[in-house]
């Protein structure tokens, strides 16, 4: 049975303090993973009892395991059904626990009643607050039954059910006619599926006689133990103030359990704790008497005390649930009450017995639940015990179940029922998933949903390059954790699998289906260097590149340029698509802006190291455009140019700069200063002799302008070839601004 | 054998100036980009500047802008750092080192020149 | 600025052991990390470039691994003359960053 249990406090002086705390002993509860199971839910049911509505409860979770529910403002927001729900998958368990007004007209005398299947239930209605009208039964919210106000027996209404079966399960309440439902008895009834002793899909199996009041699941077979009990049978006390199936849990405060009451998986029910008692659990148990609701007698003999928590307390020499047996009869020794094995092993387990005269090998045998008894093939005597070593053939599914270790000797005999779990290794269902790859590099998220039984405690990733014949690498991971597959071969596919294990001996489970994964292209290595870049205009920047000069083929698909513009916080990036590319032309900059300027080689989709960054200011907008230019060939290496001053100016100009180029000729344009501003006309010398040339001009003032027009001109005659064209020296400094 | 040879460290006084010169030699200089690595005593590693293989691009890291100037003379296979408005801070052992074509670590150091400030 | 984390910054072995020396970046700087060692009065020497890659005349018994942020350099089986100062550097991004160091000693 799962491992869960709802605690009510019902300390009720005042309903603020009152709380509802769901607890799992589940590996894993409430993670909310899919592969580790969805969290603890913990809820009022108001489909059966509906209360008037309040503020919302608040809902606390304490980890993965426990959750509390409170702010109940006032008496009746407690009354009714709650649930809680827990652990994964097939497994998924709802308890449920049912709160009774204790101010209400009428009372159960017990709240939960479990029955087998064809009882006969009986449910008893105590009256509180007398009231002479006829009393309603209802079952799950609907009309069940109506007894006459005169029919109650000794101050109780009685409802008969004969022949019960699963289906009756449910709420029960009575209440007095045309009285407030808060003030009805409400129960709740629980029909095992099987009678009395038996489980099973056909009832066929034989239950393994739970003690202490332990109720057996007629699904599984299995006890469900009352609070402050463990063990397969629930043959063993925990110590006070414990509880859960290993008695692993606490409970809160000073005073332990009282005042508390447990709700465990159907079919127990709820109860008090060990050693408690009464409609609030607040009385201790009457002495001879113990255990959960102090339903259990001692009768202790041999001189053994009662102990309201654990039973009898056997004094040396005696042992047994009455101190009933002498030590002298054989006696098994600390078996543990569960095993756990993985399928196809072939485990051995060790049965310990002492007594008078002592066992021996051939004294202790070990039964599967099939009947078939092995022998021990090998024995361990000590001076206090025997130790019986059986070694059990290859576990198949069927041998989950009750096995039990039996002692025999002239002295008498003990046994000891156990319960085996053969479980299934998990296989994963899915292969696993490709985070991120890089060029010698793949992060794998391992963690699938598989078939068998988790936990998983280690993930095995096998991998090898597709098509490959050679041994599959492995890497063992954290389940939790996403995987780096390193040094790797670049653009390569590899074939991925998951092997998943659970613990324990054999529990690795078979391989999981494959997926191809392919590591990214290799990075480009080179680092481009930044040799230059001039101002083309307030908007234009051309840059220029290098790369080191290195043997074999270019790793690189093109060039990024980034132009980062701190002031404003914006990024420009231009990509050059040719990898022989070592210049650009950058437009539609920000006039008057300071940009720091790298370049990376890029491949694929990866980027190579940057260059060191290079700053450059951008001059600020420039005047407007000369007006008029014309060309007039003077001679045969000179032109003439002229034209009026731009119109509107922001400002004095500082100089002109003329662009020459020869008409369809594919070299760079030249620029020549005119740094006489108050000039409308200059002379270019040194040109060719018949040859056409374009020509344009622009201002600059801080910043450099607009460009003119352009205009055309040929020089004359059949002069010599010249050196190149120069500006009338007219200035004392005239150049070229590159 | 390929190696480079500093020079030019010593003491000089807060505010002071002085200039380191790194003669390469066994490799074809104009090549490949270089770069200045400093390393205060008992400390750490720090880039100071780097150039590339033609000259035409510098850069400096923030503790040394507008004071430091590296530069590289190709006809005569050396590189200069040239170290002005010197402080306390700048107090460490200077190297310079050739940038690897490929991987662009750093594969040749020369020896190190120390370099203190102090009034 | 991308920072370089190096740890331990003090690992004390014995020759012959295996010696395991990690490198973190504050950001991914790809495959683009060297290593290098330096002794005490001498110039620092590269080990291992863009990662896994041995420089030219380092012994087999150094290796390099990782990319993206976490980066290991191991020697395999200590000598005497490997006792000494390691440095990894990024050149993903400038200002180039060196890590502070692990100094490597004799147990």
């Known amino acids: 049975a799962v491992d869960l249990t709802l605690l009510a406090n019902l300390r009720l002086t005042d309903p603020q303090r009152f709380f509802l705390t769901c607890v799992s002993g589940e590996a894993g509860a409430g993670r909310g993973s899919d592969a580790w199971g969805p969290p603890l839910l913990l809820e009022k049911d108001d489909r059966i009892v509906r209360t008037p509505p309040g503020p919302p409860l608040r809902l606390a979770r304490n980890g993965s395991h426990q959750v509390t529910l409170r702010g109940f403002s006032k008496p009746s927001d407690l009354v009714g059904v709650f649930s809680c729900v827990g652990g994964a998958g097939a497994r998924r368990t709802r308890v449920i626990y049912v709160h009774n007004s204790p101010g209400a007209h009428l009372l159960p005398d017990k709240v939960t009643h479990t029955v087998n299947k064809g009882d006969t239930a009986v449910l008893s209605a105590r009256v509180h607050k007398e009231k002479q009208t006829d009393v309603i039964w209802k079952s799950n919210g609907s009309y069940f039954y109506t007894l006459d106000w005169h029919e109650a027996q000794d101050g109780r209404f009685l409802l008969q059910l004969p022949n019960v079966q699963p289906p009756s399960s449910g709420i029960y309440s009575a209440t007095y006619l045309e009285a407030s439902p808060l003030g009805s008895a409400f129960f709740r009834l629980i029909v095992r599926g099987c009678g009395a002793g038996r489980w099973g899909p056909g009832c066929t199996k034989e239950c393994p006689g739970c003690l202490h009041g332990g109720v057996c699941h007629d699904h599984d077979g299995e006890c469900v133990c009352p609070p402050g009990f463990t063990g397969t049978r629930c043959e063993q006390a925990c110590r006070e103030g414990r509880f859960g199936q290993s008695c692993q849990e606490q409970c809160p405060g000073i005073s332990g359990c009282r005042g508390l009451t447990f709700c465990l998986p159907d079919p127990y029910g709820c109860s008090c704790g060990s050693g408690w008692r009464g409609s609030q659990c607040q009385e201790a148990c009457a002495p001879g008497h113990f255990g959960a609701d102090c339903r259990l007698q001692c009768q202790c003999q041999n001189g053994g005390t009662c102990d309201r928590f654990s039973g009898c307390v056997c004094p040396s020499g005696w042992h047994g649930v009455h101190c009933e047996k002498s030590d002298r009869i054989p006696q098994i020794l600390n078996m543990a009450s569960e095993l756990e094995f993985n399928l196809e092993t072939m485990p051995r387990i060790n049965c310990a017995a002492a007594g008078n005269p002592f066992p021996v090998r051939g004294s202790i045998e070990l039964r599967k639940p099939d009947g078939t008894v092995l022998l021990s093939t090998k024995a361990i005597v000590e001076p206090e015990k025997t130790t019986a070593e059986f070694e059990v053939p290859r576990l198949v599914l069927a041998d989950s179940g009750f096995w039990e270790c039996r002692v025999s000797t002239s002295g008498g005999q003990d046994s000891r029922r156990f319960k085996v779990n053969v479980k299934v290794p998990p296989v994963p269902l899915a292969a696993p998933r490709l985070l991120t790859k890089q060029s010698r590099q793949l992060v794998v998220s391992p963690l699938v949903s598989f078939s068998g039984d988790g936990p998983i405690s280690t993930v095995r990733l096998h991998y090898r390059p597709q098509d490959s014949t050679m041994d599959w690498s492995t890497i063992v991971v954290d389940p939790s954790e996403n995987v780096t597959l390193m040094n790797l071969r670049p653009k390569t596919g590899y074939s991925v699998r998951v092997q998943l294990s659970r613990p324990g001996e054999g529990g690795e489970g078979a391989w999981g289906p494959p997926t191809l994964m392919t590591t990214d292209c290799p990075e480009p290595l080179l680092q481009p260097w930044l040799e230059g870049w001039h101002v083309e205009g307030t908007d234009r920047l051309r840059v220029s590149w290098s790369l080191p000069l290195v043997p074999g083929p270019l790793v690189g698909d093109g060039f990024l340029l980034r132009l980062w513009d701190g002031t404003r916080g914006q990024e420009r990036r231009e990509n050059v698509s040719s990898p022989q590319a070592r210049t650009a032309l950058l437009t539609g900059l920000t006039p008057g802006t300071h940009y720091q300027l790298d370049v990376q080689l890029y491949h694929c989709t990866l980027l190579g190291p940057a260059s060191p960054p290079a700053h450059v200011l951008l001059p600020p907008s420039g005047p407007p455009a000369p007006r008029h230019l014309h060309a007039q060939a003077l001679s045969d290496s000179e032109i003439q140019l002229t034209w009026k001053h731009p119109e509107a100016l922001p400002g004095p100009i500082s100089k002109y700069v003329v662009e020459v180029q020869v008409a369809g000729g594919a070299g760079d344009p030249l620029w020549i200063d005119v740094d006489r501003p108050e000039e409308t006309s200059t002379i270019i010398r040194g040109l060719n002799a018949s040859t056409r040339y374009l020509f344009r001009m622009r201002a600059s003032i801080q910043g450099l302008g607009d460009w003119s027009n352009t205009v055309e001109e040929s020089t004359l005659g059949n002069g010599l070839q010249a050196e190149g064209p120069v500006q009338e020296s007219r200035a004392a400094e005239e150049g070229l601004d590159q | 054998e390929v190696q480079l040879l500093e020079s030019g460290g010593g003491l000089v006084q807060p505010g002071g100036s002085l200039r380191l010169s790194c003669a390469a030699s066994?490799?074809?200089?104009?090549?490949?980009?270089m770069i200045w690595v400093r390393q205060a005593p008992g400390k750490g590693l720090e880039w100071v500047s780097v150039?590339?293989?033609?000259?035409?691009?510098?850069s400096y890291a923030d503790s040394v802008k507008g004071r430091f100037t590296i530069s590289r003379d190709n006809s005569k296979n050396t590189l200069y750092l040239q170290m002005n408005s010197l402080r306390a801070e700048d107090t460490a052992v200077y190297y310079c080192?050739?940038?690897?074509?490929?991987?662009?670590?750093?594969?040749?150091w020369g020896q190190g020149k120390m370099v203190t400030v102090s009034s | 600025d991308i920072q370089m984390t190096q740890s331990p910054a003090t690992l004390s072995l014995s020759p012959g052991e295996r010696a395991t020396l990690s490198c973190r970046a504050s950001?991914?700087?790809?495959?683009?990390l060297a290593w290098y060692q330096q002794k005490p009065g001498q110039a620092p020497r590269l080990l291992i470039y863009?990662?896994?890659n041995r420089a030219t005349d380092i012994p087999a018994r150094f290796s390099g691994s990782g990319s993206g942020t976490d980066f290991t350099l191991t020697i395999s089986s200590l000598e005497p003359e490997d006792f000494a100062v390691y440095y990894c550097?990024?050149?993903?991004?400038?200002?180039?960053?060196f890590g502070l160091g692990t100094r490597l000693e004799i147990k």
């Open positions: 863009d990662a896994s």
């Open positions: 950001q991914s700087v790809s495959i683009y």
């Open positions: 066994g490799f074809t200089f104009s090549q490949y980009p």
């Open positions: 150039i590339s293989p033609s000259g035409g691009h510098t």
């Open positions: 550097q990024q050149r993903s991004s400038w200002p180039i960053t």
């Open positions: 080192a050739r940038i690897q074509y490929y991987g662009g670590a750093f594969d040749i």
